[in-house]
C-alpha cells in the first residue's frame, strides 16, 4: 500500500475547518474490514483519529476530527479537523495498514489575519516641529507573529528607533504593538504596515501630522 499526502502545508484560518488530505490506492476487492488507518501527531505520537477492525474508532483529539466514511473505500483517508486552533499547528502522520503498511506526514499551518492597525500619538497636542513624538501602531488577534514595517510620507523605510513587541493571548493569537520614536518635521505622514507572513496579508495604518489638528 502506498500513502500519498500533499507536499505543501495545509493553511487553515483559526476557527475554520481544515482537511488534511491523505490517500492510498486500494487493491481490487478491497474492503473496509481490511483497513487500519491511524492519524497521529508526528512528534508526540498522540493519537488523533483511527479506523481499525472495520470501524471508525472516533476522535481521540478533543472530539474535533472526522474521517470521510463514504470515501474510505475509494482510498480517501483524509482527516477533517474542525474549529482549528493555534495549538493544532504541526505535523500529522497518516498511517495506513492493509496487507502491508505505509505512512506520510502532512503539515498544518494555522493562521489568523491581523486587524486594521490603530495609531496613537504621544504627546498628542501642542506639537511643534523638532518635538520628539512616539507613534504607536497596534494590531490584534493575528497568527503567526507579524512583520512590522514603518515608512514616511515619501515611502522611505523608517528603521531606527522602532520597538516592536508581540504578545500571545490565551488563544495563542498575537497582539502586536510597534512604537516609532521620531523628531517631527514641519508636517509628515507616518505609516505602519503589519504583515501576516503566512497569509501574505498586509494591514495598514497611518497618521498625518500637519500641525493641528491631527488626522489618523
Amino acid at each position: 500500500v502506498e500513502v500519498q499526502v500533499s507536499e505543501d502545508p495545509v493553511v487553515a484560518l483559526v476557527d475554520t475547518d481544515a482537511t488534511l488530505r491523505c490517500s492510498f490506492s486500494p487493491e481490487p476487492g478491497f474492503s473496509l474490514a481490511q483497513l487500519n488507518l491511524i492519524w497521529q501527531l508526528t512528534d508526540t505520537k498522540q493519537l488523533v483519529h483511527s479506523f481499525t477492525e472495520g470501524r471508525d474508532q472516533g476522535s481521540a483529539y478533543s472530539n474535533r476530527t472526522a474521517l470521510f466514511p463514504d470515501l474510505l473505500v475509494q482510498g480517501n483517508a483524509s482527516l477533517r479537523l474542525q474549529r482549528v486552533r493555534v495549538t493544532d499547528e504541526g505535523s500529522y502522520t497518516c498511517f495506513v495498514s492493509i496487507q502491508d503498511f505505509d505512512s506520510a506526514a502532512v503539515s498544518l499551518q494555522v493562521a489568523a489575519p491581523y486587524s486594521k492597525p490603530s495609531m496613537t500619538l504621544e504627546p498628542n497636542k501642542d506639537l511643534r516641529p523638532g518635538n520628539m513624538v512616539t507613534i504607536t501602531c497596534s494590531s490584534y488577534q493575528g497568527y503567526p507573529e507579524a512583520e512590522v514595517f514603518w515608512k514616511d510620507g515619501q515611502g522611505v523605510p523608517l528603521t531606527g528607533n522602532v520597538t516592536t513587541s508581540q504578545m500571545a493571548n490565551e488563544r495563542g493569537l498575537f497582539d502586536v504593538h510597534s512604537v516609532l520614536r521620531v523628531v517631527l518635521g514641519a508636517n509628515g505622514t507616518y505609516s505602519c504596515l503589519v504583515r501576516n507572513p503566512v497569509l501574505q496579508q498586509d494591514a495598514h495604518g497611518s497618521v498625518t501630522i500637519t500641525g493641528q489638528p491631527l488626522t489618523f
Partner: antibody, heavy 119, light 109 residues
Framework: QVQLVQSGAEVKKPGSSVKVSCKAS????????ISWVRQAPGQGLEWMGG????????NYAQKFQGRVTITADKSTSTAYMELSSLRAEDTAVYYC????????????WGQGTLVTVSA | EIVLTQSPATLSLSPGERATLSCRAS??????LAWYQQKPGQAPRLLIY???NRATGIPARFSGSGSGTDFTLTISSLEPEDFAVYYC???????????FGGGTKVEIK
C-alpha cells in the same frame, strides 16, 4: 546492506529483568516493523511482540502481556526488548527481526542474544 | 488465536529426493503465510512469503502453495544444505502479530 546487531549474552537471576538492544543499519529505521522472537533451547520460534517505530505503537503476544516492553529510539535506530520477572523458562535466544519496507513479515534477523536465567 | 500445526515433525530423506512439508491453520489465514528455514546456531531465513512467493535469493527448488487453512512447502530436489528445520508462520493484520508453527525437521536418512 541491512544489518541488525544485538547486544551480548546475559546471565540473570530469577525475578530480575533483562533489556536486549537491537541496532539497525541500512534503510530508514522508522519505516520498518521490528519483531522480537525467542527460541528456548531445542524448541521452536515464539513471537513475543513488535513495534512500528514511526507510530511508536508496540503490541505483544498475549503470553507476554504485562511482562514485556518493546521500545524504539529513532535517534539511534535502536529497538529494545525488556522482559521482567524472569524465570528459568525464559532461558532462550532472543532475536530481533525486521520486515522489508512497509512489511510486517520479518526478513532480516539479528544474530540473537542468549539470555540465561539461573539462580 | 490462530494455531499452526506442522507435519510431519521429522522428515527423513536423502539428497535428491522431494520434500513435502505441511502446515495447517486452525482458521483461515488467507494467503498470509510464510516459510522459514533455520540451521543450528543460525537465525531463521525467510524462504516463502504470501504462501507462494519466493524471497530474494531463494533457489527455485523451493516452492509454496495453498490458501485458507492448508499450505505446503515443497523442496523439489534436496541439496545437502537444505537439511534444517522449517517453520511456517502466519501474520494477523491488526494489531500486527505473528504466529509460528512447531517446525518440521528435515534430516538426512
Amino acid at each position: 546492506q541491512v544489518q541488525l546487531v544485538q547486544s551480548g549474552a546475559e546471565v540473570k537471576k530469577p525475578g530480575s529483568s533483562v533489556k536486549v538492544s537491537c541496532k539497525a543499519s541500512g534503510g530508514t529505521f522508522s519505516s520498518y516493523a521490528i519483531s522480537w522472537v525467542r527460541q528456548a533451547p531445542g524448541q521452536g520460534l515464539e513471537w513475543m511482540g513488535g513495534i512500528i517505530p514511526i507510530l511508536g505503537i508496540a503490541n505483544y503476544a498475549q503470553k507476554f502481556q504485562g511482562r514485556v516492553t518493546i521500545t524504539a529510539d529513532k535517534s539511534t535506530s535502536t529497538a529494545y526488548m525488556e522482559l521482567s520477572s524472569l524465570r528459568a523458562e525464559d532461558t532462550a535466544v532472543y532475536y530481533c527481526a525486521r520486515g522489508g519496507s512497509g512489511r510486517y513479515l520479518p526478513d532480516y534477523w539479528g544474530q540473537g542474544t542468549l539470555v540465561t536465567v539461573s539462580a | 488465536e490462530i494455531v499452526l500445526t506442522q507435519s510431519p515433525a521429522t522428515l527423513s530423506l536423502s539428497p535428491g529426493e522431494r520434500a513435502t512439508l505441511s502446515c495447517r491453520a486452525s482458521q483461515s489465514v488467507s494467503s498470509y503465510l510464510a516459510w522459514y528455514q533455520q540451521k543450528p546456531g543460525q537465525a531463521p531465513r525467510l524462504l516463502i512469503y504470501d504462501a507462494s512467493n519466493r524471497a530474494t535469493g531463494i533457489p527455485a527448488r523451493f516452492s509454496g502453495s495453498g490458501s485458507g487453512t492448508d499450505f505446503t512447502l515443497t523442496i523439489s530436489s534436496l541439496e545437502p544444505e537444505d537439511f534444517a528445520v522449517y517453520y511456517c508462520q502466519q501474520r494477523s493484520n491488526w494489531p500486527p502479530s505473528l504466529t509460528f508453527g512447531g517446525g518440521t525437521k528435515v534430516e538426512i536418512k
